[in-house]
Interface confidence: medium
């Protein structure tokens, strides 16, 4: 497992390749859009610093009947070390910004790239 | 340090060809997609060509496809331009540049040559 | 094929900011690079991922990007910022890199 620098996460960091499945996996999200991400659907925001991936899925899995996103759900399910379920919210959400799923997955694409960018996965 | 240092470039006749190099050092070249770009005296730049770090994946604009080929030698750090059957259009300037992420579509530019001018005349 | 849509000019006089834009359909979900190109240089990124800078380039260049509109944000603009600019992104549609036509920041 690839440690992340000064990343603490309360469970296993995903290796390297599993990282960047995911970034693939948002890139095409945010790229191939057609139409409005899940009906424009709006999900909490949230701290992009520990247990992000956790807080992700909490935001994202609140989202239903969205396809786009349910791979993105599946990963993001694989990186928490614990389960996740609709309505579960960790201290990591802004809970007074809501913001389009949209914008969260592009948000969540660019801090990664980031970490990457940095040294941290290559 | 990142270097880029072009070569290769000239005066040559409408419908003839010519081999563009570009030496990098200083990165994993390997680990790095690579791209052309050029700019007409005068003009704004135009991306010409792109070639994924293992240089499986080719990318062209529309403007040269079928004329020009990118390929890569990661036991040389090498990239290079191949391009045939030359226009008075395509005389510009022509930049090797560095693309900053591995997966195709995040890329920017973070490094660039400083250029080699090719100059298509009878 | 995409299209990013520039200014062709930006005049500001020093000390003042400069705002130069970048138009493109849906551009917010896109990630937008910005370079800066001086007369007989190569060009340089000054901005990436929308609103990161790389580093040595001064905090006085930032950028931002939402809606159809990307902006490259100059505070306090020097004469040594005159130059061109070009935003630049990745079309998925077409597998291109685009760039915008490119402005010319003048200072007065």
């Known amino acids: 497992l690839t440690c992340l620098g000064g990343f603490a996460s309360p469970g296993p960091v995903p290796p390297s390749t599993a990282l960047r499945e995911l970034i693939e996996e948002l890139v095409n999200i945010t790229q191939n859009q057609k139409a409005p991400l899940c009906n424009g659907s709006m999900v909490w925001s949230i701290n992009l610093t520990a247990g992000m991936y956790c807080a992700a899925l909490e935001s994202l899995i609140n989202v239903s009947g969205c396809s786009a996103i349910e791979k993105t759900q599946r990963m993001l399910s694989g990186f928490c070390p614990h389960k996740v379920s609709a309505g579960q919210f960790s201290s990591l959400h802004v809970r007074d910004t809501k913001i389009e799923v949209a914008q969260f997955v592009k948000d969540l694409l660019l801090h990664l790239k980031k970490l990457f960018r940095e040294g941290q996965f290559n | 340090e990142v270097q880029l240092l072009e070569s290769g470039g000239g005066l040559v006749q409408p419908g003839g060809s010519l081999r563009l190099s570009c030496a990098a050092s200083?990165?994993?070249?390997?680990?790095?997609?690579m791209s052309w770009v050029r700019q007409a005296p005068g003009k704004g730049l135009e991306w010409v060509s792109a070639i994924s770090g293992s240089g499986g994946s080719t990318y062209y604009a529309d403007s040269v496809k079928g004329r020009f080929t990118i390929s890569r030698d990661n036991s040389k750090n090498t990239l290079y331009l191949q391009m045939n059957s030359l226009r008075a259009e395509d005389t510009a300037v022509y930049y090797c540049?560095?693309?900053?992420?591995?997966?195709?579509?995040?890329?920017?530019?973070?490094?660039w040559g400083q250029g080699t001018l090719v100059t298509v005349s009878s | 094929s995409y299209v990013l849509t520039q200014p062709p000019s930006v005049s500001v006089a020093p000390g003042q900011t400069a705002r130069i834009t970048c138009g493109g359909n849906?551009?917010?979900?896109?990630?937008v690079h910005w370079y800066q190109q001086k007369p007989g240089q190569a060009p340089v990124l000054v901005v990436y991922d929308d609103s990161d800078r790389p580093s040595g380039i001064p905090e006085r260049f930032s950028g931002s990007n939402s809606g159809n509109t990307a902006t490259l944000t100059i505070s306090r603009v020097e004469a040594g910022d005159e130059a061109d600019y070009y935003c630049q992104v990745w079309d998925s549609s077409s597998d291109h890199v685009v760039f915008g036509g490119g402005t010319k920041l003048t200072v007065l």
């Open positions: 200083g990165f994993t070249f390997s680990s790095y997609a």
């Open positions: 540049a560095k693309a900053d992420f591995w997966s195709g579509t995040l890329w920017g530019f973070d490094y």
């Open positions: 849906n551009i917010g979900n896109k990630i």
